[in-house]
């Protein structure tokens, strides 16, 4: 994995320490030849949780196009899910217009949907370079 990236089960992970909106975080990961993290298992969830700290952190899951979709095409319907109770709730009460269309890890690691413009930390994921 590149310097400052962590390896886990054949993937490399980079944990931000600053905040960006979901679209900006998504773009940042793409520019690093990566994508916002896609959580495929309870074990991967635990790994991410251990390294991210107890703060809201964007992941690569969004319903900005209608259905919930992982950014790498992983099937949401059959895949791992770890929503907080009562979530996702597409809350309109924030008063910003529209609901909540982007998913993030909460302080306890479970997921919540929120307004995509919130400046949260984020995690990038990339396949490990077999040559390294």
């Amino acid at each position: 994995c590149p310097v400052n990236w962590l390896e886990y089960e054949g993937s490399c992970y980079w944990f931000s320490r600053s905040g960006k909106s979901w679209p900006e975080a998504d773009k940042y990961c793409q520019l690093e030849s990566a994508h916002l993290v896609v959580v495929n298992s309870r074990e991967e969830q635990k790994f991410i949780q251990h390294h991210m700290g107890p703060v809201n952190t964007w992941m690569g899951l969004t319903d900005q196009s209608g259905p919930w979709k992982w950014v790498d095409g992983t099937d949401y319907e059959t895949g791992f899910k770890n929503w907080r109770p009562e979530q996702p709730d597409d809350w309109y009460g924030h008063g910003l217009g529209g609901g909540e269309d982007c998913a993030h890890f909460t302080d306890d690691g479970r997921w919540n949907d929120d307004v995509c413009q919130r400046p949260y930390r984020w995690v990038c994921e990339a396949a490990r370079d077999p040559a390294t």
Epitope: G66, E77, D89, D90, G93, G97, G98
Partner: antibody, heavy 117, light 107 residues
Framework: EVQLVESGGGLVKPGGSLRLSCAAS????????MNWVRQAPGKGLEWVSS????????YYADSVKGRFTISRDNAKNSLYLQMNSLRAEDTAVYFC??????????WGQGTLVTVSS | DIQMTQSPSSLSASVGDRVTITCRAS??????LNWYQQKPGKAPKLLIY???SLQSGVPSRFSGSGSGTDFTLTISSLQPEDFATYYC?????????FGPGTKVDIK
């Protein structure tokens, strides 16, 4: 395949009650807000009610507030609309639809409710 | 509540024509504007969401634009299957509201 199928429509007298159902399949039902939209004969679309995935948030059009109740059973992948104190102006095709701020998709085929004496 | 208006209420056009339908909101809805197509006896079909995003499976001749209060649905080259009624809908805040519709029929 993502699919919604409504049922429960029919003929009812003014002041009567009816319960509509919408059976969902092909997606994780609890992850989505659901909606009821109606269309009176020869008229346009009217939003009726919405409910969030876990029923935490519920919204109604003023025209049905206090008379209609939206609910869902995520274990049964089903959405409901309990309609009480029905009026002639409630006569319409009732559609259920998935979604929220990014639009409603898909829609069911609709079920006709006729309120007449 | 946010009121939605559409113009024209109906229009006659020929196959191949460029068709434009406008939708206006009574207050700013940023980009939370969706367009639907409905054919007689059928359920509405989502065409465009958040003003300009083309719904999956919808032909590219359909496009949407606008923000704030003024929005446009354009059909670049009308096809026989496009004769239908078109509705705009705001999803900025509750209660959600639809426009009255625009019927597109054959000239």
């Amino acid at each position: 395949e993502v699919q919604l199928v409504e049922s429960g429509g029919g003929l009812v007298k003014p002041g009567g009650s009816l319960r509509l159902s919408c059976a969902a399949s092909g997606f994780t039902f609890s992850s989505y807000s659901m909606n009821w939209v109606r269309q009176a004969p020869g008229k346009g679309l009217e939003w009726v009610s919405s409910i969030s995935g876990s029923s935490s948030y519920i919204y109604y059009a003023d025209s049905v507030k206090g008379r209609f109740t939206i609910s869902r059973d995520n274990a049964k992948n089903s959405l409901y609309l309990q309609m009480n104190s029905l009026r002639a102006e409630d006569t319409a095709v009732y559609f259920c639809a998935r979604g929220g701020s990014r639009g409603f998709d898909p829609w069911g085929q609709g079920t006709l409710v006729t309120v007449s004496s | 509540d946010i009121q939605m208006t559409q113009s024209p209420s109906s229009l006659s056009a020929s196959v191949g024509d460029r068709v434009t339908i406008t939708c206006r909101a009574s207050q700013s809805i940023t980009s939370y504007l969706n367009w639907y197509q409905q054919k007689p006896g059928k359920a509405p079909k989502l065409l465009i969401y958040t003003a300009s995003s083309l719904q999956s499976g919808v032909p590219s001749r359909f496009s949407g634009s606008g923000s704030g209060t003024d929005f446009t649905l354009t059909i670049s080259s009308l096809q026989p299957e496009d004769f239908a009624t078109y509705y705009c809908q705001q999803s900025h805040s509750f209660p959600f509201t639809f426009g009255p519709g625009t019927k597109v029929d054959i000239k």
